[in-house]
């Protein structure tokens, strides 16, 4: 059988909402990029905790092409994208893909290279100017001096494109100098410095709240006042008149 033509009324997979998994649920216009340090400064067991943190965060975001779009990239001396901002998949499937990010355990994880990748590949074209653009840089290591020559240039390039960079330093080997440089570039570039992956869970809600507060709410729907939004979930039809709030739960 041939595929049915896509008409304006066709429901894309990610438009079929999945119920929120937590009380806190970020419903804002946001493009969020997770950059995961794939160096051996994190053990494989610690990298599993890092992935758990990413998936935990994803559970607290209203992921869809209309609301929060996510990208997930593991970086070492190069970058490996697992999820792109335009990937049209169910949130549960995106979380499953994020859980399968492979541990590289490489000697080097180049923040310069991954920020360059973020600037020129992920945000090369701004296709959602109304959404906030945030990069969560999860870093546990220091790249060699020779690799960091253009670091500031890439951070400034991201600033020009209105991409907020939030560095999360993890453990004793995180590059504090680079973290401070990122912070200096823009007031929104708030850093979180943790002593180990064990602190990620403690900081998670603060980080999610911070990201969410940086993103705009959607403009009010242009439906006639007597109409409510209808959202379809797996096996459940719900009618909601809620406005899209940071913590609104559209079931």
């Amino acid at each position: 059988p041939t595929d049915a033509p896509v008409s304006p009324t066709t429901l894309y997979v990610e438009d079929i909402s999945e119920p929120p998994l937590h009380d806190f649920y970020c419903s804002r216009l946001l493009d969020l990029v997770f950059l995961l340090d794939g160096s051996s400064r994190l053990s494989e067991a610690e990298f599993e905790v890092l992935k758990a943190f990413v998936v935990d965060m994803m559970e607290r975001l209203r992921i869809s092409q209309k609301w929060v779009r996510v990208a997930v990239v593991e970086y070492h001396d190069g970058s490996h994208a697992y999820i792109g901002l335009k990937d049209r998949k169910r949130p549960s499937e995106l979380r499953r893909i994020a859980s399968q990010v492979k541990y590289a355990g490489s000697q080097v994880a180049s923040t310069s290279e991954v920020l360059k990748y973020t600037l020129f590949q992920i945000f090369s074209k701004i296709d959602r100017p109304e959404a906030s653009r945030i990069t969560l840089l999860l870093m546990a290591s220091q790249e060699p001096q020779r690799m960091s020559r253009n670091f500031v240039r890439y951070v400034q390039g991201l600033k020009k494109k209105k991409v907020i960079v939030i560095p999360v330093g993890i453990g004793p080997h995180a590059n504090l100098k680079q973290i401070r440089l990122i912070e200096k570039q823009a007031p929104e570039n708030k850093a979180f410095v943790l002593s180990s992956v064990d602190e990620l869970e403690q900081q998670r809600d603060e980080i999610v709240s911070y990201l969410c507060d940086l993103a705009p709410e959607a403009p009010p729907p242009t439906l006639p006042p007597d109409m409510a939004q209808v959202t379809v979930g797996p096996g459940l039809l719900g009618v909601s008149t809620l406005g899209p709030k940071r913590n609104s739960m559209v079931l």
């Epitope: 053990s43 067991a45 599993e48 758990a52 935990d56 859980s99 064990d198």
Partner: nanobody, 125 residues
Framework: AVQLVESGGGLVQAGESLRLSCTSS????????TGWFRQAPGKEREFVAA????????YYADSVKGRFTISRDNAKDMVYLQMASLKPEDTAVYYC??????????????????WGQGTQVTVSS
């Protein structure tokens, strides 16, 4: 919280295989790292194998390396322990244990917060 239930134990001959299963009720199993431990009569409980919440990382006790395989299917909320080339010294009650994925996967039993009731495995010579 999560409740763990083991199944698949039984009586087998030396050299045969058995597959143990652990399922959870309560929160989805993908929220937990999972381990298998065993306790033979009159002995301390010992670590057998562990798997991280994503399935990306596994650990084995030296005594079972190459013979036992731990795996998981998060879509079905199941963790398995495939046991091959069984020996009489593998006779024990086998326990499934879990700890939250925000912690590192461990081999020590103190790291695990949730435990099943156990399933008996008997290997006769």
């Amino acid at each position: 919280a999560v409740q763990l239930v083991e199944s698949g134990g039984g009586l087998v001959q030396a050299g045969e295989s058995l597959r143990l299963s652990c399922t959870s009720s309560g929160r989805a199993f993908s929220y937990y790292n999972t381990g298998w431990f065993r306790q033979a009569p009159g002995k301390e409980r010992e670590f057998v194998a562990a798997i991280s919440w994503s399935g990306g990382l596994t650990y084995y006790a030296d005594s079972v390396k190459g013979r036992f395989t731990i795996s998981r299917d998060n879509a079905k909320d199941m963790v398995y322990l495939q046991m091959a080339s069984l020996k009489p010294e593998d006779t024990a009650v086998y326990y499934c244990a879990a700890n939250r994925r925000q912690k590192t996967v461990q081999m020590g039993e103190r790291a695990y917060d949730y435990w099943g009731q156990g399933t008996q495995v008997t290997v006769s010579s």
